[in-house]
């Protein structure tokens, strides 16, 4: 292997790996034909002049998870073939000017998870072939104009998890090839108009977890190729009417965890490729007609944990492909009978944790494919005759934690529930709340003769005697039939795993303790 230092392992494929706390300097001699060198988890604190001078064929160099705090400007001299350089997860506070000089082939430069306080235009002025620059997880407070001007071939730039409070509108102006820009987890309060105008090939823009309060109306108007836009966990209180107008390629948009109070009709669109829209944890109080009408391909709409008390009958117009609708944990008291009429493909609807007092008999009239309805923790005392009769695929119905009134009016519902018990699950069945003499008794097995008779007798004697079982032979008891979208917040899927933070918050979409164990 042309000589391999004792602290390292060398493979036939010209790969050298040096790891361990006993290493305090770059091991020597390194095999002259090495093409990949990894120095990981050592106690190296500095890189002196030209430690890699004799391995000029090196293509990839990873110096990660060390104690590295100082680098001499000539440390990477003679590495003209180097394409990949990672100095991630060290303790660098300062980069010497000229450090990357001569690295004419460099395509990927990873400086993430250090303690860098600033970058300057001179740092990267020689890196004209750079395609990927990772600077996330440092202490950068500002980016000077010109810092990236020479990186015209850059396709991926990660500035997330820094301390940026503002961005100059000129800082990205020469990055016409950039496809991914990540600015998440900073302290940005606003983004000047024109900041992204030069980014005509941008496909992903990550702005989540900042303190952005306002979006300029034309902020994204030049980003026609944008596919993923992350705006969650900011302080956005309103959306300018045209802000999303020029994003025809968008397939993921996250707006959860903001301060949105209202959504104006047509605000989203046209976005023919958008499949999911996450709006939970805002302050939305009402939904007007046609607010989502441009989202013809939308399959998942999450509106939970808002303050919605009114939904206009045409609010969901156009959502013919919608599969999952989450409205739980809002302030709904009443629903119009036609509100879900257009949702012909709806499979799961979660309405729990509202204040629903009654439901119109035709509320699910056109939604024949419903498989799961969550109505627990509302103020329902009874349900209209035949409300679920046509729902042949229904296999999960949650009705517990409602104050069911077990007088003679409850008989039709009781009879239907008796015939359709598997749909309720075994964990929590609905129980009577009134009258007091039957409180706590199961609604399904209640002897209504004991209950106080109703003042008015229902015209139709009971629900149909034939149970409308789903096609499948067995029914879930405690597991939800809903897809996994129900269980988690959207994972903002990045290639570099360090940025992924899955929030397995079952309450976001609808799972309660009783269902998820």
């Amino acid at each position: 292997y042309h000589g391999c230092p004792s602290e390292c392992t060398c493979s036939r494929a010209s790969q050298v790996e040096c790891t361990g706390a006993r290493i305090v300097a770059v091991p020597t001699p390194l095999p002259w034909n090495a093409m990949s060198l990894q120095i990981l988890n050592t106690h190296i604190t500095e890189l002196n002049e030209s430690p890699f001078l004799n391995i000029s064929a090196l293509i990839a160099l990873r110096i990660e998870k060390n104690e590295l705090s100082r680098i001499t400007p000539g440390a990477f001299r003679n590495l003209g073939s180097l394409r990949y350089l990672s100095l991630a997860n060290n303790k660098l506070q300062v980069l010497p000017i000229g450090l990357f000089q001569g690295l004419d082939s460099l395509e990927s430069l990873l400086l993430s998870s250090n303690q860098l306080l600033q970058i300057q235009p001179a740092h990267f002025s020689q890196c004209s072939n750079l395609k990927e620059l990772q600077l996330h997880g440092n202490h950068l407070e500002y980016i000077p104009d010109g810092a990236f001007d020479h990186l015209v071939g850059l396709t991926k730039l990660n500035l997330g998890k820094n301390s940026l409070t503002h961005i100059s509108p000129r800082v990205f102006q020469h990055l016409g090839n950039l496809q991914v820009l990540r600015l998440y987890e900073n302290r940005l309060t606003d983004i000047p108009m024109g900041t992204f105008d030069g980014l005509v090939n941008l496909q992903e823009l990550a702005l989540q977890q900042n303190q952005i309060g306002l979006l300029s109306p034309g902020l994204f108007h030049n980003n026609h190729n944008l596919q993923r836009l992350y705006l969650s966990n900011n302080h956005i209180s309103q959306l300018p009417p045209s802000v999303f107008m020029q994003l025809p390629q968008l397939n993921r948009l996250t707006l959860f965890g903001n301060s949105l109070k209202e959504l104006s009709p047509g605000i989203f669109g046209p976005m023919p490729n958008l499949r999911e829209l996450w709006l939970y944890d805002n302050h939305i109080s009402s939904l007007p007609d046609n607010v989502f009408s441009n989202l013809r391909q939308l399959q998942v709409l999450i509106l939970s944990r808002n303050q919605i008390s009114f939904i206009s009958p045409g609010a969901f117009n156009g959502l013919t492909e919608l599969r999952e609708l989450s409205l739980h944990t809002n302030a709904l008291q009443d629903l119009d009978g036609n509100v879900f009429r257009m949702l012909a493909n709806l499979q799961n609807i979660s309405l729990q944790n509202n204040r629903l007092r009654q439901l119109p008999g035709n509320i699910f009239a056109n939604v024949n494919g419903l498989m799961a309805i969550q109505l627990q923790n509302n103020q329902l005392e009874n349900l209209p005759l035949g409300i679920f009769d046509h729902l042949g695929k229904l296999c999960e119905l949650r009705l517990y934690d409602n104050p069911w009134r077990c007088d003679s009016d409850i008989l039709p519902l009781r009879n239907w529930l008796l015939l359709n018990q598997p749909r309720l699950g075994t964990d929590t069945v609905p129980v009577c709340f009134s009258p007091a003499n039957v409180r706590g008794q199961s609604l399904i097995i209640i002897n209504v003769n004991v209950a106080v008779p109703s003042v008015h007798v229902p015209e139709v004697p009971s629900y149909p005697e034939t149970p409308w079982y789903p096609d499948t032979p067995s029914y879930p008891d405690t597991t939800s039939v809903s897809s996994t979208t129900e269980l988690t917040s959207p994972v903002e899927d990045y290639t570099d795993l360090t940025t992924i933070q899955v929030t397995d918050d079952r309450s976001v979409w609808g799972m309660t303790q009783a269902q998820s164990g």
Epitope: R305, A331, Q376, N377, A514
Partner: antibody, heavy 121, light 107 residues
Framework: QVQLLESGGGLVQPGGSLRLSCAAS????????MSWVRQAPGKGLDWVSV????????FYTDSVKGRFTISRDNSENTLYLEMNSLRAEDTAVYFC??????????????WGQGTLVTVSS | IVLTQSPSSLSASVGDRVTITCRTS??????LGWYQQKPGKAPKLLIY???SLQSGVPSRFSGSGSGTDFTLTISSLQPEDFATYYC?????????FGQGTKVAIKR
């Protein structure tokens, strides 16, 4: 008659844990939502958490999310509040309260006498 | 949602008509209750859903309002009414109390 009896309070160091209990009697426990409300010495009322009749729905005030857990044992007619990572600002009298209905509402018609939690080093 | 009660305290005589207001930072429909608390005691529910009188509470207590502005009125103050009064909204999580209004005896 309805009775709610809290227990489990006491002196604990910052970062420590306590488990409060509330024994209920005189009503059909499982058909009423229950809540914890606290009151720091000389201060106003502060809602902490609520749990629905079955225990299927739980909610918390922001300052205790991730640290406190409300639960109930309907077979034992007991409400619990598990408190971890306690801070000085959690010092208060903790009341358990019975809601007027099974679903989570903020209208409490019966209250316990309270148990004092003191977080101090 | 922030609840602001006014006044923070007031002095009145037996027989007086007393009005306490509670203003919310956002519209909460009628999802508001009023509680009375005496020193060293647990609170007592007076009014729920902004205007419904809780069972067993004297009819001199009444509540009104909707949206953001709510009022608790004691039509003729009695000796046992000297206490601190709190409003609570349960429209939106987290539920929040007002800071309280102390009703004291006028000397």
């Amino acid at each position: 008659q309805v009775q709610l009896l809290e227990s489990g309070g006491g002196l604990v160091q910052p970062g420590g844990s306590l488990r409060l209990s509330c024994a209920a009697s005189g009503f059909t426990f499982s058909t009423f939502a229950m809540s914890w409300v606290r009151q720091a010495p000389g201060k106003g009322l502060d809602w902490v958490s609520v749990i629905s009749g079955t225990g299927g729905s739980t909610f918390y005030t922001d300052s205790v999310k991730g640290r406190f857990t409300i639960s109930r044992d309907n077979s034992e007619n007991t409400l619990y509040l598990e408190m971890n990572s306690l801070r000085a600002e959690d010092t208060a009298v903790y009341f358990c309260a019975k809601a007027v209905t099974v679903n989570t509402r903020g209208f409490f018609d019966y209250w316990g006498q309270g148990t004092l939690v003191t977080v101090s080093s | 949602i922030v609840l602001t009660q006014s006044p923070s305290s007031l002095s009145a005589s037996v027989g007086d008509r007393v009005t306490i207001t509670c203003r919310t930072s956002q519209v909460i429909r009628n999802d508001l209750g009023w509680y009375q608390q005496k020193p060293g005691k647990a609170p007592k529910l007076l009014i729920y859903d902004a205007s419904s009188l809780q069972s067993g509470v004297p009819s001199r207590f009444s509540g009104s309002g909707s949206g953001t502005d709510f009022t608790l009125t004691i039509s003729s103050l009695q000796p046992e009414d000297f206490a601190t009064y709190y409003c609570l909204q349960d429209n939106n999580y987290p539920w929040t109390f007002g800071q309280g209004t102390k009703v004291a005896i006028k000397r």
